[in-house]
């Protein structure tokens, strides 16, 4: 009788993660008596995947009933495949022996490759906000995919970016891979509503790429422009001075009025108006009683935006231009309705 051969007809098998892999194996003879075992890898470090006689292998089922006399089909199914299952699987015939069965003949091996989807890309921006005209870096990461081939693209508001660098790790063979990409983006004043998108395409995604996004509103700081103007006189001895704070983002802003360098009033921007580009405008005003001043008054609107150093704009109020009214007030009126802002 011809000596038993172990036949593994498939050189390779490709399975998607989460699915079941079928590893085929047949023997050409029932002789000698003894079990079949499946291993991943060869040599002393090989991993036992299935033993017909001993052990518990909950993920493995046999394709046919191995207890039947004339059965020579030793194919197995491995359920819930993960990238960690990738490798070469050997169907090995043993003959009965004591205390352990004796390896008799091995199949040529079947390489199991696992197609695993990449994780949803995670895009992260710089830790601190930056102002327009500055270049900021965004990173995109995706993990757990196999095979290694993958395509990553960056977009800003639908326009593809070209200034980025991408690495796929590890460089050598692995059960699964990770991608890491860094893109450089130049900020503009109009970027509050802008989005940066990282798009990952992989064979497992069947033409439907995964996207990760970052809103530039989390990254950008648009400093305000200030304009201080003197409004028409409301009463003979009162002047209305306004500070227009325009085109700023984010909203966090504190304004201080100074009269001749002395703090007159401090307020925080609350009810603001939003521009189409996502930036904000705000206006503060101050009623100045000119009759309380003998000399010219220097009014300063000082704005601290988003924790940055204060910026200011000054306006010189000419007291001589207005006849002095009777009264001995020495300070600007800033009580009652004067403390209200006009929006």
């Amino acid at each position: 009788e011809e000596e038993l051969q172990v036949i593994q007809p498939d050189k390779s098998v490709l399975v998607a993660a989460g699915e079941t892999a079928t590893l085929r194996c047949t023997a050409t003879s029932l002789i000698p008596v003894g079990p079949i075992q499946w291993f991943r890898g060869a040599g002393p470090g090989r991993e036992l995947i299935y033993n017909q006689k001993e052990g518990h292998f909950p993920r493995v089922t046999t394709v046919s009933d191995l207890t039947k006399r004339n059965n020579m089909d030793f194919s197995i199914r491995i359920g819930n495949i993960t990238p960690a299952d990738a490798g070469t699987y050997y169907c090995v015939k043993f003959r009965k022996g004591s205390p352990d069965d004796v390896e008799f003949k091995s199949g040529a091996g079947t390489e199991l490759s696992v197609r695993a989807k990449p994780s949803a890309p995670v895009v992260s921006g710089p830790a601190a906000r930056a102002t327009p005209q500055h270049t900021v870096s965004f990173t995109c990461e995706s993990h757990g995919f196999s095979p290694r081939d993958i395509t990553l693209k960056w977009f800003k508001n639908g326009n593809e970016l070209s200034d980025f660098q991408t690495n796929v790790d590890p460089v050598g063979e692995s059960v699964s891979y990770s991608i890491h990409s860094t893109a450089k983006v130049v900020l503009t004043r109009e970027d509050v509503h802008s989005q940066v998108i990282c798009e990952v395409a992989h064979v497992t995604l069947q033409g439907d790429p995964l996207r990760g996004t970052a809103n530039l509103s989390e990254t950008i700081r648009v400093p305000p422009t200030l304009e201080v103007t003197q409004q028409p006189v409301r009463a003979e001895n009162q002047v209305n001075v306004t500070c227009q704070v325009r085109k700023f983002y984010p909203q966090r802003l504190q304004l201080t009025w100074l009269e001749n360098g002395n703090v007159s009033r401090t307020e925080t921007a609350s009810t603001v108006t939003e521009n189409k580009d996502g930036t904000y405008n705000w206006m503060s005003w101050l009623l100045v009683n000119v009759s309380a001043h003998r000399d010219d008054v220097k009014l300063t609107c000082q704005v601290e935006h988003d924790g940055q150093p204060a910026v200011s704009k000054s306006h010189d109020l000419k007291v001589s231009a207005h006849p002095k009214e009777q009264g001995s007030n020495t300070a600007a009126e800033n009580t009652g309705s004067n403390e209200r802002n006009i929006y």
């Epitope: 008596v33 001993e54 207890t67 009965k96």
Partner: antibody, heavy 120, light 107 residues
Framework: QVQLVQSGAEVKKPGASVKVSCKAS????????MHWVRQAPGQRLEWMGY????????KYNEKFKGRVTITRDTSASTAYMELSSLRSEDTAVYYC?????????????WGQGTTVTVSS | DIQMTQSPSSLSASVGDRVTITCKAS??????VAWYQQKPGKAPKLLIY???YRYTGVPSRFSGSGSGTDFTFTISSLQPEDIATYYC?????????FGGGTKVEIK
Amino acid sequence: QVQLVQSGAEVKKPGASVKVSCKASGYTFTSYVMHWVRQAPGQRLEWMGYINPYNDGTKYNEKFKGRVTITRDTSASTAYMELSSLRSEDTAVYYCARSYYDYDGSFDYWGQGTTVTVSS
Amino acid sequence: DIQMTQSPSSLSASVGDRVTITCKASQDVTTAVAWYQQKPGKAPKLLIYSASYRYTGVPSRFSGSGSGTDFTFTISSLQPEDIATYYCQQHYSTPWTFGGGTKVEIK
């Protein structure tokens, strides 16, 4: 290491029954088939039947059918052979023996044997 | 049932001699034949299965051959510890059946 340990010797009267036990250790009891083989004095070995502990499947030699019952207790890793309606020619050493499959009749491990004497 | 006819029923040989035992099946059993050694008061011990496969731990002086209906068991160089009765057995189909045995003695 694999061991099959059988119960002690029995003396029975004709017409009675005998139940011999075989406790297995050192391997997964349900993964191998347990056979019973007897050897009467000066006679050849004679296969009586088997039990597959995995599925409780049994098969008996027609010669003993109706008189032999093989059972198992998987929790105790023990197989039993009961022979009824004993006659003097049933005097023999009874062995339990292990095989890999129910279609495999080559026995790699044997119990030490249990002597059953049938005498009035 | 398949009958297994073993011969000789006994033999006497000197230490170092080549000893051959034959077994004939009443019908084709392919290569499903086992050989056992049994010493007095002991259980049989598996030596050869599937006609020619030596069980682990069995000395290489023991060998088996044959297929179909004719089978041979050989001890290439008889040793004092080989004194025993040897049985052939077909493990092709139930009921598994044994030969009558060959008692091997030292001259």
